[in-house]
């Protein structure tokens, strides 16, 4: 477990090895205290398939940059990114997808089919969420990619599209 | 509350009744450190309604067996599933189910109908989640349940389709 | 920080200002041990948009009057809702919507369309969830609108449809 | 180890539908992702699309509307349809493996077997 | 989808080093670690000598190395030996859950 999830724990506070049932400090020093979480929402221009963020949204113990969230304190996070879309349906079906990227890998990815009736209607509606828990080191970015940007209705949803993450455990 | 919250947390040191907030060993053991946790992916191979899962994905203080995972500390925990299914629409509706069973029986469940044009089409995507917050006891059993299993895509999606519960609370 | 984490605390036990890492009670008194928590069900006979819930449910840390889960310790709070829907279709589409509502303000909102093929069909299932991750102060209140309410099939889904909060963290 | 041949007509009239089929020896084609691309005389590669061992496709958008691909487990084979061919698709065409690993995220690593490659002509 | 934009040749003695860029767009290149390059021969199919940016396939020379940087790609070999001669490709993943090929460099080692 790690052992400096107590601010301003002083150093030079020696952690005893094997029990330390009794070490009063080195209980407190190894209990998962440290709290991390973000909660952003969609930029109001989107541009590129990789989401870009209000940075003025909730940050606590995480970055924000370029649009990515960056990790600060190592960790088992929960992540989950949902995204209201407004498909304009053309003659044929669309495939909404939704990726979690991990440092630039995808992670795990969501899809949905509309429009899939192939008729021109004048605009469907979908919701589209991805959830994940896994460890993240600091420095570790996590970032949105929507081949599909352009069916996010930022003007009429501008508070719908989020990126949230918190940490659940600072141990390992 | 539980008082095992706390590893190595000697059965010998009494805990007063009633108020112990002066009592700091007391107050660390009803404190709420445990931490449990599972995430994991599905099984390659799926040839049941009730889906198996890899169990070398993320397990603390819960076990994997026979499909289930099997809680080992009791409290209140968050469940959550989500899976990925890829349908190769015939001429008819597909109605699509998630089960979550807590002990075998079904605790909560979700169902998205696909294909309603009735027109047969390529493949229609479609994400499913279902979540719950329940109290569990040990030995406790979560397992998920799909009727229609083959159109749960692992070979295109191995990393979609996830069961994943944490411990928030382990007090009463 | 809160400094009221620790149920009992007594009032008299003076909180160092700036590093009390070795004045073990003010840690324990700034860590964030507090935990809220609601999980409720729908109730059975919805009569109007804004959606009543069993007050019978999972309740702790959390009251519920009128409609309104009503928030008793300020914090950071999870939110999610979760609905299940059964429509017969009309000969048009139909757009479901959840609306999350933070002290009468709709703070978030799902949209999904179903039924787009416009054809009259037996029934189509949908599933639509939302979360919120807010600061939420003592005595605001939580509720969840949702405009077609005679689409949430209560008797044949009692256990489908719910709203959970949850504490994440105390401090600011 | 995992070895690819193409096959299929050389020669194509304009306006029909250019068929070719990769046999898979050495790996079962339910285990992997599979390509297409090809290559016009001297000019550089281009990727036609994908099949997934379940079936489902990925196309290059340009291409989309005249792409077919297919598999047949039995016979260890995927293949490729492109309709209504012009003078434009005259080229080599490859398939491929594709390398994928997704022990902890997905690792889309590129094209690590090859086919020799076959040159089919489009001309009446 | 457009190619990614290579140089159409590069030269190099032997013993020195030669970087070939490869650049996209912020929905291939810059958006995913999935870029790969191909070396081929006259006449003969295409070989996997990088993958996922910087990784090398067992069997290539750690002479070939590659990076990114924004939406830029670059393949460096370095000690150039004759029989590196040859075209090189570039590739990269894109958010449509494709792949795009650049238009290639031929490498020719004076």
């Known amino acids: 477990q790690r052992t400096d999830s107590i601010p301003n724990s002083p150093d030079n506070i020696p952690l005893r090895g094997g029990n330390c049932s009794e070490d009063l400090l080195c209980i407190l020093k190894r209990a998962p205290f440290k709290k991390s979480w973000a909660y952003l929402q969609v930029a109001k221009h989107l541009n590129k398939t990789k989401l870009s963020w209000n940075k003025d949204g909730i940050l606590h113990g995480v970055r924000y940059q370029d649009g990515n969230l960056v990790i600060q304190f190592p960790g088992l996070y929960f992540i989950i990114c949902q995204l209201q879309f407004l498909v304009q349906c053309p003659n044929n079906s669309v495939d909404l997808k939704l990726e979690l990227l991990i440092n630039k890998h995808i992670k795990k990815q969501a899809l949905v089919t509309v429009c899939e009736s192939g008729m021109q209607t004048k605009h469907v509606y979908q919701n589209l969420s991805q959830f994940l828990l896994d460890y993240l080191q600091v420095n570790t970015t996590v970032s949105v990619n929507v081949d599909t940007f352009q069916y996010i209705d930022t003007s009429t949803f501008p508070l719908e599209n989020v990126l949230s993450v918190f940490l659940y455990s600072n141990s390992d | 509350q539980r008082t095992d919250s706390i590893p190595n947390s000697p059965d010998n040191i009494p805990l007063r009744g009633g108020n112990c907030s002066e009592d700091l060993l007391c107050i660390l053991k009803r404190a709420p450190f445990k931490k449990s946790w599972a995430y994991l992916q599905v099984a390659k191979h799926l040839n049941k309604t009730k889906l198996s899962w890899n169990k070398d994905g993320i397990l603390h203080g819960v076990r994997y067996q026979d499909g289930n995972l099997v809680i080992q500390f009791p409290g209140l925990y968050f469940i959550i599933c989500q899976l990925q299914f890829l349908v190769q629409c015939p001429n008819n509706s597909v109605d699509l189910k998630l089960e979550l069973l807590i002990n075998k029986h079904i605790k909560k469940q979700a169902l998205v109908t696909v294909c309603e044009s009735g027109m047969q089409t390529k493949h229609v995507y479609q994400n499913l989640s279902q979540f719950l917050l329940d109290y569990l006891q040990v030995n406790t059993t979560v397992s998920v349940n799909v009727d229609t299993f083959q159109y749960i895509d692992t070979s295109t999606f191995p990393l979609e389709n996830v069961l994943s519960v944490f411990l928030y609370s382990n007090s009463d | 920080q809160r400094t009221d984490s620790i149920p009992n605390s007594p009032d008299n036990i003076p909180l160092r200002g700036g590093n009390c890492s070795e004045d073990l009670l003010c840690i324990l008194k700034r860590a964030p041990f507090k935990k809220s928590w609601a999980y409720l069900q729908v109730a059975k006979h919805l009569n109007k948009t804004k959606l009543s819930w069993n007050k019978d449910g999972i309740l702790h840390g959390v009251r519920y009057q009128d409609g309104n889960l009503v928030i008793q310790f300020p914090g950071l709070y999870f939110i999610i809702c979760q609905l299940q829907f059964l429509v017969q279709c009309p000969n048009n589409s139909v757009d479901l919507k959840l609306e999350l509502l933070i002290n009468k303000h709709i703070k978030k909102q799902a949209l999904v369309t179903v039924c787009e093929s416009g054809m009259q069909t037996k029934h189509v299932y949908q599933n639509l969830s939302q979360f919120l991750l807010d600061y939420l102060q003592v005595n605001t209140t939580v509720s969840v609108n949702v405009d077609t309410f005679q689409y949430i099939d209560t008797s044949t889904f009692p256990l489908e449809n719910v709203l959970s909060v949850f504490l994440y963290s105390n401090s600011d | 180890q995992v070895q690819l041949q193409e096959s299929g007509p050389g020669l194509v009239k304009p306006s029909e539908t250019l068929s070719l089929t990769c046999t898979v020896s050495?790996?079962?084609?339910?285990?992997?992702?599979w390509s297409w691309i090809r290559q016009p005389a001297g000019k550089g590669l281009e990727w036609i699309g994908r099949?997934?061992?379940?079936?489902?496709?990925n196309y290059n958008p340009s291409l989309r509307s005249r792409v077919t691909m297919s598999r047949d487990t039995s016979k260890n084979q995927f293949s490729l349809k492109l309709s209504s061919v012009t003078a434009a698709d005259t080229a080599v065409y490859y398939c491929?493996?594709?390398?994928?690993?997704?022990?902890?995220?997905?690792?889309?690593?590129?094209?690590?077997?090859w086919g020799q490659g076959t040159t089919v002509t489009v001309s009446s | 989808q457009s190619a990614l934009t290579q140089p159409a040749s590069v030269s190099g003695s032997p013993g020195q080093s030669i970087t070939i860029s490869c650049t996209g767009t912020?929905?291939?290149?810059?958006?995913?670690?999935?870029v790969s390059w191909y070396q081929q021969q006259p006449g003969k199919a295409p070989k996997l000598m990088i993958y996922?940016?910087?990784k090398r396939p067992s069997g290539v020379s750690n002479r070939f190395s590659g990076s990114t940087s924004g939406n830029t790609a670059s393949l460096t070999i370095s000690g150039l030996q004759a029989d590196d001669e040859a075209d090189y490709s570039c590739?990269?993943?894109?958010?449509?859950?494709?792949?795009?090929f650049g238009g290639g460099t031929k490498l020719t080692v004076l």
């Open positions: 099949i997934f061992a379940s079936g489902s496709t």
């Open positions: 996922e940016v910087s």
């Open positions: 050495g790996g079962s084609i339910s285990s992997y992702y």
């Open positions: 590739s990269s993943y894109t958010s449509s859950s494709t792949w795009v």
């Open positions: 912020s929905s291939d290149v810059g958006l995913y670690n999935y």
């Open positions: 491929a493996k594709e390398r994928v690993g997704v022990q902890d995220y997905y690792h889309y690593s590129g094209m690590d077997v």
